[in-house]
Interface confidence: medium
Amino acid sequence: ELCDDDPPEIPHATFKAMAYKEGTMLNCECKRGFRRIKSGSLYMLCTGNSSHSSWDNQCQCTSSATRNTTKQVTPQPEEQKERKTTEMQSPMQPVDQASLPGHCREPPPWENEATERIYHFVVGQMVYYQCVQGYRALHRGPAESVCKMTHGKTRWTQPQLICTGEMETSQFPGEEKPQASPEGRPESETSCLVTTTDFQIQTEMAATMETSIFTTEYQ
């Protein structure tokens, strides 16, 4: 089930998915001066079975110099309602399908792809927010949003994140409370999701962290 809307927009913040749920579509967009190859895929699709998920179809771009106009790829009409742009990040995440069952990782870049990626998310997708450079987080979290199905309609949960400029006052006048009161960990809000189940499993597995000196130079 595709999500009807885009994830919420937070001023001065960007969002990113850690992994994409099966059913997610990624438009095959090409940068200016290039177009999809003839009979090329319109989109990549995250598909899989119980043990493995991967992106179906390959996006391919070719020079459009021989044409009079640059053809811009747009979603099909039925996709139009859920057109979400995320900026390309370089370097891309490693393609590691094993860590989150039922999810695909960020697809590797294709030659001459557009600078922004347009995803069509499905119910259960989680995205994470961070303030852009030059802004700092006020109400430090949970800076995530989940597409949920409620009474037959999809909606994104509201991330508790405000990004304020370094020069701005650290407290807004009259701003005493976060947008939603902190009542519990995200698991309680989204316990049906594979991603949050993972978080819970991690806690129960008593995750560990180990520090060590990597390089020390003494002069």
């Epitope: 990040q89 995440q93 994470y128 961070q130 006020l138 430090r140 991690q202 597995m205």
Partner: antibody, heavy 106, light 107 residues
Framework: PGSSVKVSCKAS????????ISWVRQAPGQGLEWMGG????????NYAQKFQGRVTITADESTSTAYMELSSLRSEDTAVYYC????????????WGQGTTVTVSS | DIQMTQSPSSLSASVGDRVTITCRAS??????LNWYQQKPGKAPKLLIY???SLQSGVPSRFSGSGSGTDFTLTISSLQPEDFATYYC?????????FGQGPKVEIK
């Protein structure tokens, strides 16, 4: 003094990318001081103003490892350096590394 | 940056005592307050998050309360293993800041 140190922090036991990894230091007999943090899926780090320009925090998702490099070391940087995991900058730092002692001496 | 002030600066107590540590923020931080316990030579351990939620695996004798600027950590009946330093930390805004951490010592 004047040199750099790079401390690594390897996470095991689950998802690494979506957590915030913070670096906190503790000078001998002193309290806890947050230096900065990173959310690996974004790759960009936040730093405390005090350390801005002297600290660099990075993360390698493929190895579930975070790094903290502190340059232009001075004697007052002698401390135990901890990495800690936060469930997205809000629910407290629930998993901590055992700490790495850095001694700056001439 | 938000300043966190804890009181008392240190305290002596006996096993079985009810112990209360307070933490005051320099501005309202809603419920974005966490409590940690630290023993000598060890990493801090999260006890309470979001002012009053008990972290998994932490004994129920620990409790937290408060919102806005004033917060309290209570140990209902002090146990031998509870003698340690306790830090409060705000996670309302960046950078997160800690209180100075009073030490709970054996009387």
């Amino acid at each position: 003094p004047g040199s750099s140190v790079k401390v690594s922090c390897k996470a095991s036991g689950g998802t690494f990318s979506s957590y915030a990894i913070s670096w906190v230091r503790q000078a001998p007999g002193q309290g806890l001081e947050w230096m900065g943090g990173i959310i690996p899926i974004f790759g960009t780090a936040n730093y405390a103003q005090k350390f801005q320009g002297r600290v660099t925090i990075t993360a390698d998702e493929s190895t579930s490892t975070a790094y903290m490099e502190l340059s232009s070391l001075r004697s007052e940087d002698t401390a135990v350096y901890y990495c800690a995991r936060e469930m997205y900058y809000y629910y407290g730092m629930d998993v901590w590394g055992q700490g790495t002692t850095v001694t700056v001496s001439s | 940056d938000i300043q966190m002030t804890q009181s008392p600066s240190s305290l002596s107590a006996s096993v079985g005592d009810r112990v209360t540590i307070t933490c005051r923020a320099s501005q309202s931080i809603s419920s974005y307050l966490n409590w940690y316990q630290q023993k000598p030579g060890k990493a801090p351990k999260l006890l309470i998050y979001a002012a009053s939620s008990l972290q998994s695996g932490v004994p129920s004798r620990f409790s937290g309360s408060g919102s806005g600027t004033d917060f309290t950590l209570t140990i209902s009946s002090l146990q031998p293993e509870d003698f340690a330093t306790y830090y409060c930390q705000q996670s309302y805004s960046t950078p997160p800041t800690f209180g100075q951490g009073p030490k709970v010592e054996i009387k």
